[in-house]
Amino acid sequence: SGTTNTVAAYNLTWKSTNFKTILEWEPKPVNQVYTVQISTKSGDWKSKCFYTTDTECDLTDEIVKDVKQTYLARVFSYPAGNVESTGSAGEPLYENSPEFTPYLETNLGQPTIQSFEQVGTKVNVTVEDERTLVRRNNTFLSLRDVFGKDLIYTLYYWKSSSSGKKTAKTNTNEFLIDVDKGENYCFSVQAVIPSRTVNRKSTDSPVECMGQEKGEFREI
């Protein structure tokens, strides 16, 4: 029935934060639809987002099965209303994505300071252990569960009256820092995976300052 005017997808891009993973591509479809397939290097192709007019596909459910695997996706283009039709080579047009290894490449989401507590000249700062969509034994794992000691947090802290930011680091979710008595401090944290060469750091958490809601002060 003649050739069809479908165009191949392009600019296939992985967008992933804390393992929530979406494949995006172009162009916006005109008289065509898309289907996505995903596979590990050694596995079979699995189809997702069938005949969609979207230019994104949430592949989280697939990649969380094994975040240390390397995945490849491909996007097929079909004529709208005639998805059985194929390209001139006898099969639908498709484009491959770059390879994606979630454990090495997912962006670290913005962390949150859960609480801070001052006892005398020490302050304990706790970072919220964010839940991911990675599951083990039907339970969602936290970021710390997934990354273990590969994940560290950097705490930036400073006197409210000063600009210089001191740093502390931890491979747990807690910091214990020394502060000057009678001074108010502000805090911000960053998640870091030091062993990475790309996507090493999260954006900074919102700044929290002593004398505000989150903290607790105890004079000892």
Epitope: K169, S188, P194, D204
Partner: antibody, heavy 120, light 107 residues
Framework: EVQLVESGGGLVQLGGSLRLSCAAS????????IHWVRQAPGKGLEWVGY????????YYADSVKGRFTISADTSKNTAYLQMNSLRAEDTAVYYC?????????????WGQGTLVTVSS | DIQMTQSPSSLSASVGDRVTITCRAS??????VAWYQQKPGKAPKLLIY???FLYSGVPSRFSGSRSGTDFTLTISSLQPEDFATYYC?????????FGQGTKVEIK
């Protein structure tokens, strides 16, 4: 290959100013912390200050606070050390170094250094 | 600021000798201590991080250990290329501080 290259050193008058550059290649400075460390002739290493280029946060040694400013331009992948009100005791080789931001905070790569001489 | 007191300030040794350099922190720094080697006219090079971990490419004759606030760099069998100055550094808190250095000279 990871490399840090300092430039901008030289002879400067007492009370004068100088800007040092630290050009990075083989990695993106936004993912790391960059420190400046100096070494006076025949002396040991003295930490000067740091910048986290991802957020602009800095901290300085007391000996340079208020006189030195560290900045970074992530588009140029370069960190800078602006030195004002220079004193004789600021004469040193100045190094920039990369902090991988591990828990122990070691400096894994250093530049070759640039000599700053403050003369009266 | 945390002081790192390094000793000795210099030592003379022969090729094949076992050499030990120590650093004492003025307060707890956990394992956040690194050791660097510096040769004249050159930048320092990282040898040991996290008190006892050998940096990649560094010969296995170098080792580091910790006992409380005392940190030790050991060269098990000194080689000609090891004659240099060695520095310890803590980065447990800001500002990071260096020891005064130990110059290892040929006997």
């Amino acid at each position: 290959e990871v490399q840090l290259v300092e430039s901008g050193g030289g002879l400067v008058q007492l009370g004068g100013s100088l800007r040092l550059s630290c050009a990075a290649s083989g990695f993106t400075i936004g993912g790391y912390i960059i420190h400046w460390v100096r070494q006076a002739p025949g002396k040991g290493l003295e930490w000067v200050g740091y910048i986290d280029p991802s957020n602009g946060y800095t901290y300085y040694a007391d000996s340079v606070k208020g006189r030195f400013t560290i900045s970074a331009d992530t588009s140029k992948n370069t960190a800078y050390l602006q030195m004002n009100s220079l004193r004789a005791e600021d004469t040193a080789v100045y190094y920039c170094a990369r902090d991988i931001q591990s828990v122990s905070g070691e400096f894994d790569y250093w530049g070759q250094g640039t000599l700053v001489t403050v003369s009266s | 600021d945390i002081q790192m007191t390094q000793s000795p300030s210099s030592l003379s040794a022969s090729v094949g000798d076992r050499v030990t350099i120590t650093c004492r922190a003025s307060q707890d720094v956990n394992t956040a201590v690194a050791w660097y080697q510096q040769k004249p006219g050159k930048a320092p090079k990282l040898l040991i991080y996290s008190a006892s971990f050998l940096y990649s490419g560094v010969p296995s004759r170098f080792s580091g250990s910790r006992s409380g606030t005392d940190f030790t760099l050991t060269i098990s069998s000194l080689q000609p290329e090891d004659f240099a100055t060695y520095y310890c550094q803590q980065h447990y808190t800001t500002p990071p501080t260096f020891g005064q250095g130990t110059k290892v000279e040929i006997k």
